[in-house]
Structure formats: structure tokens, C-alpha cells
């Protein structure tokens, strides 16, 4: 249904080949996407409330797309600068993470359940309680299937987990 | 050809270190999802940690097993990980493999075998 | 954790036969955001390390013999060996990724008669 004004391939941006995405304006994709979609031609790529759109073969749709599935993109993405500037990006750090079963989490409410119901005591990062909850507006196709809000993926609590100890140069706070 | 070469295994009394590492080559080492998982003699297969990408600030996620006794970090100029092991318990012995989780794929290293033994 | 479940724990077949591996997970594999199950079939012959067969629970990793085939969607999978070699003699593990920790089944045994 490319073309389709309502279908899963209905752009509201498309990014020309030409003119690939600024560095800021990735980092901003890769904390919004939800989903994508491969259409014949291009991808799009559902983030909050809209969605963007580039050519199959553009180096910066595969990398977008490779993020989503490695589960780097979207709700697990902490972002160097905006999620975590108690961090210090200069080196890698050496942390240490609480570890659970964090399940593919449907509603917000679900998920403020499951974070008072853990036994490891999971906190939230610095800045991600944010408007990264919103679903889509109804009337825009997603390939989400049914039952899955926009906040539920792999490991789409695992930005809930955040270190129980401080270690090496990066000292994390959290905030219970 | 993605190749994974673990090394640093050997033979280690309770309670005390050592510390893996793993050369990677052949694929974007800087984009993948790195992990360590072992396996016991004549045991199953259990994984032991993971280090996220640069873009999520190398965070880091252990198994219960393992967790405050050992450390994982990447250093993305050289193409290598690295697993320092402390407190080693007799229940760590284990042939201790590093994956590279591409969308291409997760691959697998040969192997490095730890054993603790007094 | 996610639980994932194989069965069975060993058979033997005969060579030519054909083989089905069952692994069933404690949640749903497949991610909305992608349409893909994350799910993967191992193959490990003794004193080797695991090599990988399929990932996204049906796509053939390079390399693999075209007997191999993995499928399934949501919590239940299936590998299937068509055609059984005597080279096909290993433990078979399913892996899920979909979350952390990973989790992987307790094997199966394929023997030949």
C-alpha cells in the first residue's frame, strides 16, 4: 500500500537520498522510534507521533534499522547527552547493572506496576521520565500487533534498570 | 570472515582472578551487542553478561550468578572485550565463549576455558 | 527470565529421516517494532563451540545446508532437519534474545541409528 495515505507506508517526512539526517537529528531518531516498517522502496520509521521515511539503500536507514533490532534504538535508548549527563562519556565505563525479567511491557500503567511490584528494585533514569510513553494517534497505521502499546518491545524495561553500585570512572546516580 | 578469539582462561584457585579478553574482527565491532556466555563441563549453556553500544553509554548487565565479582567493558578503538573475573567461585569453571549479537547474525568465539579448582 | 522449554531431549533417527526440534518460550519472541521473532537454533558438536543455524527464528545463517530450516512465531518454534546426514550427530540448543538475560533450552540429543 505505498502511496497509501493511512497505510503502513504513508510517510509525514521523506528524506531524500541526497540529503541524509544531521547527527542531531539521528540521535533524535534513535531515542523516538517505535517501529519500521519495509516498504518496496524505502523504509518508514514510526516514531511518536509521526513518522519518517528514507531509501532502502541510504547507510543511514540500515543503521537505523540495525539499531532498532539490537535493540539499541527506542525505549532502551539512554543517549549520551540527554538521558544521562551524570555519566562521563569519555571512556567506557565499567558498571554494573540490576538484572530482571523485564517483559514486554504494554501501558505505562503496567509499567509503573511492574516497577513498584520488582524484587530488584529497578530505577528510573535521569530524564527518561519523559513523553517517550505516548502512543501513536489512532488514526495512524502502525505494524504494531495487537496488544503492544509503542512502549512495549525487547527488553523495553531495561531502561528501567540502572546500576545498584557505583564502579570505575562513571559514577551513575538513580533515583528511586 | 567475523573471527572472535577469546583468551586468558587457565587454571585459578577460589577466590581468585582473572581477567578474559576477546579480539574481534571481520564485522562493525563498534555496532554490535557484545555478550560472554559459558558453559560448565557437560552442562547447557548460560549467559554471563552483556555491554551495549557507545550511543547507551556501554551500560552493562550481569547474571545474578556473577554480579559484583565480575566487570565487562569494550574498548571499541581496539576491537576487544574484556571480562575481569574476581572472587572466582568453583561453580565459574566453565569453557567461556564472547558473541557478537549482529542483525547479521550472533557469532561465537571457540572458547577460553576457566577452571577453579583448589 | 524467559523460560524456553525444548523437547525432546534426545532421539535417534535414522539417516534420510527427517528431525523436528520443539522449543517453546514462557512469553512471545516477536517484537511490534520489528515483526521479528528473536530467536535463535544452535548446532554443537562435542569439544566445539555453538554454531548458529538460524536467527530471527527462520532465517539460515551463511553457510548452513539448506536441510535446516527453523519457524514459528510468538512462543512456539521448530527446527527441522530434513535428510539427516551422519554429520548432523549434535546437541541442539534454542537461544532466545529477545530480552536480557539470555536464555537458552537444555538441548537436544540427535543421534543416528
Known amino acids: 500500500n505505498e502511496g497509501s495515505v493511512t497505510g503502513s507506508c504513508y510517510c509525514g517526512k521523506r528524506i531524500s537520498s541526497d540529503s541524509p539526517p544531521s547527527v542531531q537529528f539521528m540521535n533524535r531518531l534513535r531515542k523516538h522510534l517505535r517501529a519500521y516498517h519495509r516498504c518496496l522502496y524505502y523504509t518508514r520509521f514510526q516514531l511518536l507521533s509521526w513518522s519518517v521515511c528514507g531509501g532502502n539503500k541510504d547507510p543511514w536507514v540500515q543503521e537505523l534499522m540495525s539499531c532498532l533490532d539490537l535493540k539499541e534504538c527506542g525505549h532502551a535508548y539512554s543517549g549520551i547527552v540527554a538521558h544521562q549527563k551524570h555519566l562521563l562519556p569519555t571512556s567506557p565505563p565499567i558498571s554494573q547493572a540490576s538484572e530482571g525479567a523485564s517483559s514486554d511491557i504494554h501501558t505505562p500503567a503496567q509499567m509503573l506496576l511492574s516497577t513498584l511490584q520488582s524484587t530488584q528494585r529497578p530505577t528510573l533514569p535521569v530524564g527518561s521520565l519523559s513523553s517517550d510513553k505516548e502512543l501513536t494517534r489512532p488514526n495512524e497505521t502502525t505494524i504494531h500487533t495487537a496488544g503492544h502499546s509503542l512502549a512495549a518491545g525487547p527488553e523495553a524495561g531495561e531502561n528501567q534498570k540502572q546500576p545498584e553500585k557505583n564502579a570505575g570512572p562513571t559514577a551513575r546516580t538513580s533515583a528511586t | 570472515e567475523v573471527q572472535l578469539v577469546e583468551s586468558g582462561g587457565g587454571l585459578v584457585k577460589p577466590g581468585g582472578s582473572l581477567r578474559l579478553s576477546c579480539a574481534a574482527s571481520?564485522?562493525?565491532?563498534?555496532?554490535?551487542?557484545m555478550n560472554w556466555v559459558r558453559q560448565a563441563p557437560g552442562k547447557g549453556l548460560e549467559w554471563v553478561a552483556r555491554?551495549?553500544?557507545?550511543?547507551?553509554?556501554?551500560?552493562?548487565f550481569y547474571a545474578d550468578s556473577v554480579k559484583g565479582r565480575f566487570t565487562f567493558s569494550r574498548d571499541d578503538s581496539k576491537n576487544t572485550l574484556y571480562l575481569q573475573m574476581n572472587s572466582l567461585k568453583t561453580e565459574d569453571t566453565a569453557v567461556y565463549y564472547c558473541?557478537?549479537?549482529?542483525?547479521?547474525?550472533?557469532?561465537w568465539g571457540q572458547g577460553t576455558t576457566v577452571t577453579v579448582s583448589s | 527470565d524467559i523460560v524456553m522449554t525444548q523437547s525432546p531431549d534426545s532421539l535417534a533417527v535414522s539417516a534420510g529421516e527427517t528431525v523436528t526440534i520443539n522449543c517453546k518460550s514462557s512469553?512471545?519472541?516477536?517484537?511490534?517494532?520489528?515483526?521479528?521473532?528473536?530467536l535463535a537454533w544452535y548446532q554443537q558438536k562435542p569439544g566445539q563451540s555453538p554454531k548458529l543455524l538460524i536467527y530471527?527464528?527462520?532465517t539460515r545463517q551463511s553457510g548452513v545446508p539448506d536441510r535446516f530450516s527453523g519457524s514459528g512465531s510468538g512462543t512456539d518454534f521448530t527446527l527441522t532437519i530434513s535428510s539427516v546426514q551422519a554429520e548432523d550427530v549434535a546437541v541442539y540448543y534454542c537461544?532466545?534474545?529477545?530480552?536480557?538475560?539470555?536464555?537458552f533450552g537444555g538441548g537436544t540429543k540427535v543421534e543416528i541409528k
Open positions: 558473541t557478537a549479537w549482529t542483525t547479521e547474525g550472533i557469532y
Open positions: 571481520g564485522f562493525t565491532f563498534s555496532n554490535a551487542v
Open positions: 555491554i551495549r553500544t557507545k550511543p547507551n553509554n556501554y551500560a552493562t
Open positions: 512469553q512471545s519472541l516477536l517484537y511490534s517494532g520489528n515483526q521479528k521473532n528473536y
Open positions: 530471527w527464528a527462520s
Open positions: 537461544q532466545q534474545y529477545y530480552d536480557t538475560p539470555w536464555t
